[in-house]
């Protein structure tokens, strides 16, 4: 058993049929010694008396808010949560496996630049009685500071018969140098509590590996005289690290119709303009990627050909 | 990167071109190592990230773009020792900090070159003959060092008398290649920045 936060405790349980469970001793936070009784949740049934209560925690029915009272007055609370371990593996029931970039990916993180700011998100089908708490650091043995905000519900989607909820959090490394060469990864830890179930999820990464620039901005077309070709130009996204001559991007320019199966024109360039063939009912799209370290491409920025 | 090959800038351009070749060569070699040594811990997640130049050179600090010198987090350990000018910059562009930066890059390359050559000598003794260093990568390191043209004492190649542990050597190769790729990215950024200045 360990303390998650004040008056909230996590009991780690090996979860299998007829498991013996864990013996837990609760102590009432009071100078009083006599006349103390214990109840669980909303029930008025007295579970025991005295300053301490010993319980055998085996299942979710044994978890919950234990309260000690004296003469009708509440003295203190202890909330017990369960963390299940099945076949030596901690449960991951609360969050959905995003399976990208590999199986057992519950947390996904992205950074728009090298400033040390990044966003992580996760998915769940649970809509109520759900709380998250996020901590992060650079390295684990001698951790350096990373400050994370509160996790918020950022999107709701319908997937078949189910509703899916996306939560996200923004974090900022306390003293980040955009030009630094990372040798210690960022560690992100998410505590998830659903009703009386506790789970934790972690992710470890280098900022350089989670870079995904914003799409290029200000796409403009200039038809070329006596030609099917158009010159398309764009600018670096505002959120990209500066100076751009140091943090350079490379671009992919594509002309395609509405369907992915349609024919296309595609060219890669390090410049902020390119010449392509425009077709009726097609769009010109441009996306960006770090020129020197191939992490993710940005989303496409598009303009219609006409 | 977009300058025509026929008329390179007499200043930075040769170094820019060589640094691009360097990054391509080390990325290629790292990819090859990851494929060939698929049953060894050779991915970024599996290896320890070591920097053999740590406390010996200060490339990131010495080559920091002017725009980032206002960022206190980038200024932990800027060194200011005098280093003579290399040939990559036309003299009108040369400044004390640039010379220090290019000299630091040169020292990085020299250290990695020694490590890679020592390692290759060991890998050549491996009866499995599983992996060797790409001669192109070694040649590209050499070309960039020549383009930088700093005078510096030659570092003797390390020789070891004991029987090499090939498993450890291959893991060290992965560690070295990951670190060198990161440094090659920095070098490429620096050359691109200096070329644009």
């Amino acid at each position: 058993i360990w303390e998650l936060k004040k008056d909230v405790y996590v009991v780690e349980l090996d979860w299998y049929p007829d498991a013996p469970g864990e013996m837990v001793v609760l102590t009432c936070d009071t100078p009083e010694e006599d006349g103390i009784t214990w109840t669980l949740d909303q029930s008025s049934e007295v579970l025991g008396s005295g300053k301490t209560l010993t319980i055998q925690v085996k299942e979710f029915g044994d978890a919950g808010q234990y309260t000690c009272h004296k003469g009708g007055e509440v003295l203190s609370h202890s909330l017990l949560l369960l963390h299940k371990k099945e076949d030596g593996i901690w449960s991951t029931d609360i969050l959905k496996d995003q399976k990208e970039p590999k199986n057992k990916t519950f947390l996904r993180c992205e950074a728009k630049n090298y400033s040390g700011r990044f966003t992580c998100w996760w998915l769940t089908t649970i809509s109520t009685d759900l709380t998250f708490s996020v901590k992060s650091s650079r390295g684990s043995s001698d951790p350096q500071g990373v400050t994370c905000g509160a996790a918020t519900l950022s999107a709701e989607r319908v997937r078949g018969d189910n509703k899916e909820y996306e939560y996200s959090v923004e974090c900022q490394e306390d003293s980040a140098c955009p030009a630094a060469e990372e040798s210690l990864p960022i560690e992100v830890m998410v505590d998830a509590v659903h009703k009386l179930k506790y789970e934790n999820y972690t992710s470890s990464f280098f900022i350089r590996d989670i870079i995904k620039p914003d799409p290029p901005k200000n796409l403009q077309l200039k038809p070329l005289k006596n030609s099917r070709q158009v010159e398309v130009s764009w600018e670096y996204p505002d959120t990209w690290s500066t100076p751009h001559s140091y943090f350079s991007l490379t671009f992919c320019v594509q002309v395609q119709g509405k369907s992915k199966r349609e024919k296309k024109d595609r060219v890669f360039t390090d410049k902020t303009s390119a010449t392509v063939i425009c077709r009726k009912n097609a769009s010109i799209s441009v996306r960006a990627q770090d020129r020197y370290y191939s992490s993710s491409w940005s989303e496409w920025a598009s303009v219609p050909c006409s | 990167r977009n300058l025509p090959v026929a008329t390179p800038d007499p200043g930075m351009f040769p170094c820019l071109h060589h640094s691009q070749n360097l990054l391509r060569a080390v990325s290629n070699m790292l990819q090859k190592a990851r494929q060939t040594l698929e049953f060894y811990p050779c991915t970024s997640e599996e290896i320890d990230h070591e920097d053999i130049t740590k406390d010996k050179t200060s490339t990131v600090e010495a080559c920091l773009p002017l725009e980032l010198t206002k960022n206190e987090s980038c200024l932990n350990s800027r060194e200011t020792s005098f280093i003579t000018n290399g040939s990559c910059l036309a003299s009108r562009k040369t400044s004390f900090m640039m010379a220090l930066c290019l000299s630091s890059i040169y020292e990085d390359l020299k250290m990695y070159q020694v490590e890679f050559k020592t390692m290759n000598a060991k890998l050549l003794m491996d009866p499995k003959r599983q992996i060797f260093l790409d001669q192109n990568m070694l040649a590209v390191i050499d070309e960039l060092m020549q383009a930088l043209n700093f005078n510096s004492e030659t570092v003797p190649q390390k020789s070891s008398l004991e029987e090499p542990d090939f498993y450890k050597t291959k893991i060290k190769l992965c560690i070295l290649l990951h670190a060198f790729r990161i440094r090659a990215v920095t070098i490429d950024r620096v050359m691109s920045y200096l070329n644009a200045s």
Epitope: R266, T269, I277 | R1, N2
Partner: antibody
């Protein structure tokens, strides 16, 4: 299977015009760009131009501008290359090639030898 | 027009050898470069697109690399069926242009 089948060999006199065909099968003809590339004996490959069969848009290499016409007939799924004012240096194998991407060549015809000789 | 220069123009090698062919562009073409194999009397066949992207059905012993002006095609362990002529082609701008070709012949 995506296939391009070209018409047979031609022998032409200098100054004449040649028209070769390229019949597509195994895909929707207008879904791919169609290019023509030639190869003189013991020489390299030379791109001549492309057509978008969907709308008839064409683009030609400056070297052949004014002498070459590329057309496409969507009713027969056939592309054509017409080269006029033939000279001996036009002796070559002419290939049609197709792709959903405009700038490289995924599927090739078997080639048509055009000999220009007096 | 962008000139593409291939080297060497021919290379003699044995089965099992590692062969590298290079291609240089007269100006930067990013990764807009493709490789083809051509056997005598046959049409070319696409091997690699955009400098390093593999083509389905092409053996993994063929690999491409490079960007900007310098590119290479490597055949890792030469097989009897690999003796042919190889061409690079740039797609950075029109007109599309090819390298002069490299003949890989039996030693």
């Amino acid at each position: 299977e995506v296939q391009l089948v070209q018409s047979g060999a031609e022998v032409k006199k200098p100054g004449a015009t040649v028209k070769i065909s390229c019949k597509a099968s195994g895909y929707t003809f207008s879904d791919y760009y169609l290019h023509w590339v030639r190869q003189a004996p013991e020489k390299g490959l030379e791109w001549m131009g492309w057509i978008d069969p969907e709308n008839g848009d064409t683009e030609y290499a400056p070297k052949f501008q004014g002498r070459v016409t590329i057309t496409a007939d969507t009713s027969t799924d056939t592309g054509y290359l017409e080269l006029s004012s033939l000279r001996s240096e036009d002796t070559a194998v002419y290939y049609c090639a197709a792709n959903k991407e405009l700038r490289y060549f995924d599927v090739w015809g078997q080639g048509t030898l055009v000999t220009v000789s007096s | 027009d962008i000139q593409m220069t291939q080297s060497p123009s021919s290379v003699s090698a044995s089965v099992g050898d590692r062969v590298t062919i290079t291609c240089r562009a007269s100006q930067s073409i990013s990764i807009n470069l493709h490789w083809y194999q051509q056997k005598p009397g046959k049409a070319p066949k696409l091997l690699i697109k955009f400098a390093s992207q593999s083509i389905s059905g092409v053996p993994s012993r063929f690999s491409g690399y490079g960007s900007g002006t310098d590119f290479s095609l490597t055949i890792n362990s030469l097989q009897p069926e690999d003796f042919a002529r190889y061409y690079c082609q740039q797609s950075n701008s029109f007109p599309l242009t090819f390298g002069g070709g490299t003949k890989v012949e039996i030693k």
